[in-house]
């Protein structure tokens, strides 16, 4: 049966026993800045082009053992959430991956900047349709990373990022705090903010909306047909990147402001239990869970 | 995220290094009254001292970025410091990425076209 997260973002009219908008997102290219990925996994084969971009720091620890499947784990899962054949949101979207996170899931602001610059140069050399950039990563507040995101957004690129998994104000992190970026927090099947160990999803006024981010089934790099459940604001951001790809595929001329407005408009309102957030953050945190547009857009989204 | 907010620095550290009066033989002095600023990550364990993004003013051309980077290297060498230009930015932001001692920050902030300098820091999969 349909995984809970796909059911949650699907308008009631389409809740059959399977989720299948066949060409959702087919006019859009989604860039993923993450770990390396297993691009020939059955769930994503042929959908993800691994670019030759790689800018990662060395792994910590002298006895670190680099295991390919672990190195690929985070990125493979997210690529599957965005565009996977069976458990993906935008099954028609094509993706390009850039490696900016090492096998321990760690990267640098500078490596991410160079990655964003690579995307801009690719866009200039070979202009295609709408671009979505997924940044499933977070660091401390960075003026330069936010500035680069702002420039890319002004060039017509839609940037989607994880709010962060620090149970903290997202405004203290980048790129989550960049105003031009769509920043996504994570909720679970009960529409509760996601708890991750002693921490959890970030919150606050720098978050634009929430999306499913707990127990999300997606491609596992353990084997070419494996699936695994992962949680985090990265998974939530991947849902919104997929939804954005479908919206832009249906309406390629949408501006960032219009897309953001549509994402908010079609979100489920006031379903999140705000008691989880610190009292002073409740009024600042948007009570919105991302969803696809309803049946009025049938011809656009499910053609 | 969330458009419409004013810039939020949180407890982000901004260190404004005052420019000294002696100019160190620069052909082009920075514009009068502008002070380049230095930024670093507020979360200490995430800091990566020794690598810096030197961000130049918005309309700076690639050739000027390269020239500024070379000038920094030359002035650092005169003081006995080794530096390495890791990347020259253009396309999104003008500037360059440099591996150098933190002792050179004061010097770097005086370079022409410099808007601000940010110490590199870590980002993490979420």
């Amino acid at each position: 049966s349909i995984p809970w997260n796909l059911e949650r973002i699907t308008p009631p009219r389409y809740r059959a026993d399977e989720y299948q908008p066949p060409d959702g997102g087919s006019l859009v290219e989604v860039y993923l800045l993450d770990t390396s990925i297993q691009s020939d996994h059955r769930e994503i084969e042929g959908r993800v082009m691994v670019t030759d971009f790689e800018n990662v720091p060395e792994e910590d620890g002298t006895r670190f053992h680099r295991q390919a499947s672990k190195c690929d784990s985070h990125g493979t899962h997210l690529a599957g959430v965005v565009s996977g054949r069976d458990a993906g949101v935008a099954k028609g979207a094509s993706m390009r991956s850039l490696r900016v996170l090492n096998c321990q899931g760690k990267g640098t602001v500078s490596g991410t900047l160079i990655g964003l610059e690579f995307i801009r140069k690719s866009q200039l050399v070979q202009p295609v349709g709408p671009l979505v950039v997924l940044l499933p990563l977070a660091g401390g507040y960075s003026r330069v990373l936010n500035a680069a995101c702002q420039r890319l957004a002004r060039a017509g690129v839609v940037l989607v990022t994880a709010a962060g998994n620090f149970r903290d104000d997202a405004c203290l992190y980048s790129p989550a705090s960049a105003p031009e970026v769509i920043t996504v927090g994570a909720t679970n099947a009960q529409d509760q903010p996601v708890t991750l160990g002693t921490l959890g999803t970030n919150f606050g006024r720098c978050v634009d909306l929430f999306a499913p981010g707990e127990d999300i089934i997606g491609a596992s790099s353990d084997c070419s047909t494996c699936f695994v459940s992962q949680s985090g604001t990265s998974q939530a951001a991947a849902h919104v990147a997929g939804i954005a790809a479908m919206m832009l595929s249906a309406e390629p001329e949408l501006t960032l402001a219009e897309l953001r407005q549509r994402l908010i408009h079609f979100s489920a309102k006031d379903v999140i239990n705000e008691a989880w957030f610190p009292e002073d953050q409740r009024v600042l945190t948007p009570n919105l869970v991302a969803a696809l547009p309803p049946s009025t857009h049938e011809n656009l989204y499910f053609q | 995220g969330a458009m419409g907010q004013e810039d939020e620095d949180g407890d982000y550290e901004e260190l404004v290094l005052a420019l000294r009066s002696e100019e160190d033989g620069l052909a082009e002095a920075p514009e009068h009254g502008t002070t380049a600023t230095f930024h670093r990550c507020a979360k200490d364990p995430w800091r990566l001292p020794g690598t810096y993004v030197v961000v130049l003013k918005e309309e700076t051309h690639l050739s000027q970025s390269e020239r500024t980077a070379r000038r920094l290297q030359a002035q650092a060498a005169r003081r006995g410091y080794l530096t390495k230009i890791l990347h020259v930015f253009h396309g999104l932001l003008p500037g360059f990425l440099v591996k150098m001692s933190g002792d050179l920050l004061e010097l770097a902030l005086k370079l022409p076209h410099v808007d601000y300098i940010e110490e590199d820091s870590s980002v993490f999969a979420q």
């Epitope: 691009s39 020939d40 084969e45 082009m49 047909t225 | -």
Partner: antibody, heavy 115, light 109 residues
Framework: QVQLVQSGAEVKKPGASVKVSCKAS????????ISWVRQAPGQGLEWMGW????????NYAQKLQGRGTMTTDPSTSTAYMELRSLRSDDTAVYYC????????WGQGTTVTVSS | QSALTQPASVSGSPGQSITISCTGT?????????VSWYQQHPGKAPKLMIY???NRPSGVFNRFSGSKSGNTASLTISGLQAEDEADYYC?????????FGGGTKLTVL
Amino acid sequence: QVQLVQSGAEVKKPGASVKVSCKASGYTLTSYGISWVRQAPGQGLEWMGWVSFYNGNTNYAQKLQGRGTMTTDPSTSTAYMELRSLRSDDTAVYYCARGYGMDVWGQGTTVTVSS
Amino acid sequence: QSALTQPASVSGSPGQSITISCTGTSSDVGGYNSVSWYQQHPGKAPKLMIYEVSNRPSGVFNRFSGSKSGNTASLTISGLQAEDEADYYCNSYTSTSMVFGGGTKLTVL
């Protein structure tokens, strides 16, 4: 254009081994593995397994476990399928196809096992 | 892995429509969005006609269409032509592998 070119026909004795090659071109190798499919005379298609150009990982059909080995050589863009301890019922046309989606096929390699 | 069930043969006259069914279980056809259909002429390699239940690769005529309901997938060929005479195989993901149908011989009368 996307192409898979297979090695020529083979005649083998029972108990012997055969190694069929499949050279891929015209696409990004690491975005797809290679599936191997066989078809005995007058019979249907049988999926034998899959091998990765990305990391060499394999996924064998249960029936093949132990007797077959699939490998790739990314430097020559070539995938290989070796079948050991051949029996007469291994006589078939062996196809390679691109990925699990099997959207592009090789021309086929006839393997005849006969004493 | 037992093969998916297809009718051994179907036939139709030129211009007519025919449908070939492919029945599996919830562990294969019913559980995945990845049912494919292949056409094979005698002595030739199979050719992909439909992928992911209902999508047509470029170059395949829109006379060919695919659908799925529950554990059964179907291939429909409308406006039947002489060159459509061939063997047709369905294929589906299973949890760890791939499984083909036994094949259907289409005769154009």
